[in-house]
């Protein structure tokens, strides 16, 4: 997260760290007792490493009573996701067992009504992604509030030049932005999950390159079918 601040500890009990061989790789969001939603491209970076999900964490390194690392029983990338595009960049991870719920671990309601978030709406994005252009990684969860950007502006040639489909949404990126390591994490508007940080190799913090988020409402049928 660029230009953000440390989150209040455990105030986002849905927040997950998708880890490979014990290292944070991507963000994720607990959407059901045994399921974490993340970004499909995160699996590509995992190679053949052991994928696990950390729940109930604020600090990645320090012991915390609510922290627990779960093995992944099944990884389900969206069937239409491709390495060379950010289309359909969603991944569902089934935990080896149901998460132990509590004040620091709780699923987040996700948007099912397929309607665009009003431009200008302030939404919260959180993650353990880099906090500087130099690539500094935080130990504790960071967050930032970002205004939603209308799709027409996001589709301008100097922004994303027509690449933003109706299944994506954008948020402003003027110094405050999601960045590398935040992919797969939640964009939360009004207490509801609206978007998932896409995992392209986008420049961060440049206002002409807005953050791109996969709209979960556009994938309600797929999410429901996997969770069923």
């Amino acid at each position: 997260i660029l230009g953000g601040r440390e989150a209040e500890a455990h105030a986002r009990p849905y927040m997950a760290s998708v880890q490979v061989n014990g290292e944070h790789l991507c963000g994720g969001v607990l959407v059901a007792e045994q399921w974490v939603l993340s970004a499909a491209h995160c699996l590509e970076d995992a190679a053949d490493g052991k994928v696990q999900v950390l729940l109930g964490a604020h600090s990645l390194s320090q012991p915390e009573p609510s922290k627990r690392l779960y093995d992944v029983l099944r990884a389900v990338p969206h069937p239409d996701s491709r390495p060379d595009t950010i289309d359909h960049d969603l991944l569902l991870l089934q935990l080896s067992e149901k998460a132990t719920l509590g004040p620091a671990v709780r699923p987040l309601p996700w948007q099912r009504v397929d309607r665009d978030v009003e431009p200008g709406t302030l939404c919260d994005v959180a993650g353990w992604g880099i906090v500087s252009h130099a690539g500094r990684r935080p130990d504790r969860l960071q967050h930032v509030l970002l205004p939603v950007l209308d799709r027409a502006t996001c589709n301008r040639r100097t922004h994303h030049d027509g690449a933003i489909t109706q299944r994506m949404m954008c948020a402003e990126s003027n110094r405050r932005d999601s960045c590398k390591g935040d992919s797969g994490g939640p964009l939360v508007c009004g207490g509801v999950l609206e978007g998932v940080v896409t995992s392209g190799s986008r420049v961060c913090g440049n206002r002409k390159k807005p953050g791109i988020y996969t709209r979960v409402a556009s994938y309600a049928a797929w999410i429901d079918s996997v969770l069923a």
């Epitope: 799709r151 027409a152 502006t153 301008r156 040639r157 100097t158 027509g162 690449a163």
Partner: antibody, heavy 116, light 112 residues
Amino acid sequence: EVQLQQSRPELVKPGASVKIFCKASGYTFTDYYMNWMRQRHGETLEWIGDINPNNGDPSYNQKFKDKATLTVDKSSSTASMELRSLTSDDSAVYYCAREGPSFAYWGQGTLVTVSA
Amino acid sequence: DVLMTQTPLSLPVSLGEQASISCRSSQTIVHSNGDTYLEWYLQKPGQSPNLLIYKVSNRFSGVPDRFSGSGSGTDFTLKISRVEAEDLGVYYCFQGSHVPPTFGGGTKLEIK
């Protein structure tokens, strides 16, 4: 299939105004800016301005700010451009073009002829 | 405004020959985001312009690979490796990095 259908040719008198239209189909109108260009006979293209269909917010080439007014009607997915105080210099083909990717999609053009 | 100067004004070629069109901008057209928004359009007689190349060297979908774009800073080139009859028309370079966006004066590709 993305289509931009422009209104028919116009013959107008000097000093008059004219409004030309660009109806979009095959995509969600509010997802892309609409741009307008002018091309006088045998000459290059000139950018007049653009408009965000979400909020109707236009921006203009300084050269055309007193000549053109851009508007949109979201309900009919139509962009329009009014040209005022017309002179023979304004005789040209006027194009609308969707922005994104680049100017990949253009209307067929509307010929405006200013003549007494 | 950024002036886009194209040369030559007219380019007579034989079918199957290579054609090369130059475009020079009056200032650098590298955008503040690091990208260069230099595009090439072909306008056939009586038609609207068609996008060929965007961001200097990227072919738009459906554009044959005999078209290629190159250049940087202020100097750009469009090459057609083997001219076909359907390639005839007026070619325009365009910059979208600075407001207002501007087109070059055009190069008419015609049969020798």
